[in-house]
């Protein structure tokens, strides 16, 4: 679609004479009628195929015309046409006298034509006007004429629809040959897509509207390049969403059971050496001088019993010191001045002489050792509580103080993470190597399933014919809103069919 | 015995959509997910995405990001996979396998479904 | 996305031989994150090794698993009759995770 234009400048006809060479009366009164058509090799009468055009009067003899002529008439004349422009045409510009007002083919004389002139030739669509004269025996016409595009159409035969839109359709303006020129911010053929933030991630990103940056379910940070972890996951990662890559030292579903309880808690104290035992488990080895779970107590160091065949220990500022009973001698009164004759032995261990009599040793019931017999046999020097349990003297036996988490005689079990009901709401409790786990009854989620969740009664789709459906989040049940032509509590009755009930 | 069981062959048209189901038995069902693999002939195996049975959280593959559903029942234990707008290229054997979200392989396998897509 | 390649497309070899099988990514990828499964004909795949290097439960250990980065290696050190099959790695630490498109262990 698009326009030819042509600008009449100047008709002369000095003499104001007519064609026939009769002169006007009083004068010429001329206006002009225009015929644009297809190009012909010899311009002949015939339909104006790509329109016509006439003028009111715009002078008298010889005048000049003004651009937008007053009168009602426009310069330039303007001839549309909404077909592909073929580049090229003819052209036929009659000038007429107008006797009176009545401009129509029929009411003017066939005499009352001034002059004609027929032109033909190849004119391409553009900006630039062509300048033309046409001279015959009486008049002279100076005119320019030239073809450009109608709104919103392009290229070089204005064949190219393009209108300039800023909305959910698209987002660009046109360049000269009718290609798109997409504004700042989009993008693709039509430029519908928004360019995202600058580094957004391809896949795991998108956007609705230019410099913006929204994450698929899974991931998150300003770019979308950092995935979520599984929900729960408490010393893990993950390098694509939901999962739950534990730590060094954490183990379990969520990674949430310390593997090292050493490094992560440093449990033992003054300088103690400490070992993983298990989970959440660990040993202290006590650097001497020191006792305890932990080697949180400062021994005396009288508490070791350095003194033998029952000699009383002192503890001193730089050490201790042994008082020995009758009969011995020594740092730790371990040399004896006694024989067996002066019935050294206790508890009724049997005395048996050694090197002729100068010396003697003790045989000592059970229960008893030192080398008088003097000292209760200490059941906890062979370290029988497991898993850091404390061995405890109690007269004839001795017993483990277990630490949270263990029993049994020996500290040798753990107590069942179940046993102590944790899961809420009739969740089915499991032991698991690394802890426990609650499998929650439909309508309650969590680690212990305290967290109440609606159920979702939409999940087995009750609706019929494409009925959407919608929880009512109170109650737990479901309501189908029905397309149109359905009703009945789950559309599933045609309207115009009424339900065949049994009765 | 750690045990996947899939729904049985179906046959479609172009555009229509399929569910195929997969039931789990053998192990504790929330504490795992299930991921959805094909195989056809032309493309391999192609993970299709996974699904939490502990929380419902998925993850699908982006190519079928737009006509894909997974859902879990953790009552029946059983897992379900719906692919809409259904094409003739998506005729293939589809599986579901188990997954964890800290362990990263798919072990053990259903048997398979085969889907064909035909006019 | 990541692509896995594996080489050669088909092995053919007798049994009692060694069989190397070879898997590489396009870009690199965490070892904890690789497997490796066996396909029989009819069949549905079954995970052989995990952790690039680590063989899953029941599976017989003239299977090795090794390689990190980008070159992962799947080795049969003695075929036996029931090894004939076709062979898959997988890599799941990027989104998709992608298989390769397999290896066919044929008798010679």
């Known amino acids: 679609s698009g326009v030819f234009q042509l600008q009449l400048q100047e008709f002369i006809n000095e003499r104001g004479v007519l064609a026939s060479g009769r002169p006007c009366e009083p004068g010429c009164r001329t206006f002009f009628r225009v015929c644009l058509k297809h190009f012909q090799a010899v311009v002949s009468p015939g339909p104006c195929t790509f329109g016509t055009v006439s003028t009111p009067v715009l002078g008298t003899n010889s005048f000049a015309v003004r651009d937008d002529s007053s009168g009602g008439g426009r310069n330039p004349l303007q001839l549309p046409f909404n077909f592909t422009w073929p580049g090229t045409f003819s052209l036929i510009i009659e000038a007429w006298h107008a006797p009176g007002d009545d401009l129509r083919p029929e009411a003017l004389p066939p005499d009352a034509l001034i002059s004609k002139i027929a032109i033909q030739g190849s004119l391409a669509v553009g900006q630039n006007w062509l300048l033309d004269e046409q001279t015959s025996t009486l008049t002279r016409l100076r005119y320019s004429y030239r073809v450009i595009c109608s709104d919103n159409y392009y290229g070089d035969n204005c064949s190219r629809l393009c209108k300039k839109r800023n909305d959910h359709f698209g987002h660009y303006v046109c360049q000269p040959d009718g290609n798109l020129s997409c504004l700042p911010g989009w993008t693709g053929e039509y430029c519908q897509q928004p360019i995202c933030l600058s580094g957004c991630h391809e896949q795991n990103g998108y956007c609705s509207k230019p410099a913006e940056c929204l994450c698929r379910p899974g991931w998150q940070g300003r770019l979308c390049n950092e995935c979520i972890p599984h929900n729960g996951c408490r010393h893990g990662t993950c390098s694509t969403p939901w999962q739950c890559t534990c730590d060094e030292g954490w183990g379990g579903l969520f990674c949430d059971q310390d593997l090292n309880y050493c490094t992560h808690h440093s449990p033992c104290k003054n300088g103690a050496t400490c070992s993983n035992s298990g989970q959440r488990s660990y040993t202290c080895t006590c650097r001497p001088g020191y006792t305890g779970v932990d080697c949180e107590l400062e021994l005396s160091e009288c508490d070791s019993n350095p003194c033998r065949n029952g000699g009383s220990c002192k503890d001193q500022e730089d050490g201790y010191h042994c008082l020995c009973p009758p009969g011995y001698y020594g740092l730790h009164c371990e040399h004896s001045t006694l024989s067996c004759a002066d019935s050294p032995c206790f508890n009724g261990g049997s005395c048996r002489e050694r090197n002729q009599g100068a010396n003697y040793a003790c045989e000592c019931p059970p229960n008893f050792t030192g080398s008088n017999c003097e000292k209760k046999v200490d059941r906890c020097t062979s370290n029988p509580c497991a898993n850091g349990g404390q061995c405890l003297n109690r007269g004839p036996s001795r017993m483990c103080r277990c630490r949270p988490g263990f029993t049994g005689t020996y500290c040798e079990l753990h107590v069942s993470d179940c046993a102590r009901n944790p899961c809420a709401h009739g969740g089915t409790c499991h032991d698991l190597e690394n802890g426990l786990m609650c499998t929650c009854p439909a309508g309650f989620s969590g680690r212990r399933c305290e967290v109440r969740t609606s159920i979702d009664a939409c999940a087995s789709s009750p609706c019929f014919n494409r009925a959407t459906c919608y929880t009512d989040l109170s109650t737990d049940t479901f309501v189908c809103n029905c397309p149109y032509g359905f009703v009945g509590s789950r559309c599933e009755f045609p309207v115009g069919l009424p339900p065949s009930f049994p009765w | 015995e750690v045990q996947l069981v899939q729904s049985g062959p179906e046959v479609k048209k172009p555009g229509a959509s399929v569910k195929v189901s997969c039931k789990a038995s053998g192990y504790t069902f929330t504490y795992y997910g299930i991921s959805w693999i094909r195989q056809t002939p032309g493309q391999g195996l192609e993970w299709m995405g996974w699904i939490s049975a502990y929380d419902g959280n998925t993850d699908y593959a982006q190519k079928f990001q737009d006509r894909i559903t997974m859902t879990t029942d953790t009552s029946s234990t059983t897992a379900y996979m719906e692919l809409r707008s259904l094409r003739s290229d998506d005729t293939a054997v589809y599986y579901c396998?188990?997954?964890?979200?800290?362990?990263?392989?798919?072990?053990?396998w259903g048997q398979g479904t085969m889907v064909t897509v035909s006019s | 996305e990541i692509v896995m390649t594996q080489s050669p497309g088909t092995l053919s070899l007798s049994p009692g031989d060694r069989a190397t099988l070879s898997c590489r990514a396009s870009q690199s990828v965490t070892g904890s994150y690789l497997a490796w499964y066996q396909q029989k004909p009819g069949q549905a795949p079954r995970l052989l090794i995990y952790?690039?290097?680590n063989r899953a439960t029941g599976i017989p250990d003239r299977f090795t698993g090794s390689g990190s980065g980008t070159d992962f290696t799947l080795t049969i050190s003695r075929l036996e009759p029931e090894d004939f099959a076709v062979y898959f790695c997988q890599q799941s630490a990027f989104s998709p995770w992608t298989f390769g498109q397999g290896t066919k262990v044929e008798i010679k």
């Open positions: 952790g690039a290097s």
């Open positions: 396998a188990r997954y964890s979200w800290n362990k990263h392989w798919f072990d053990p």
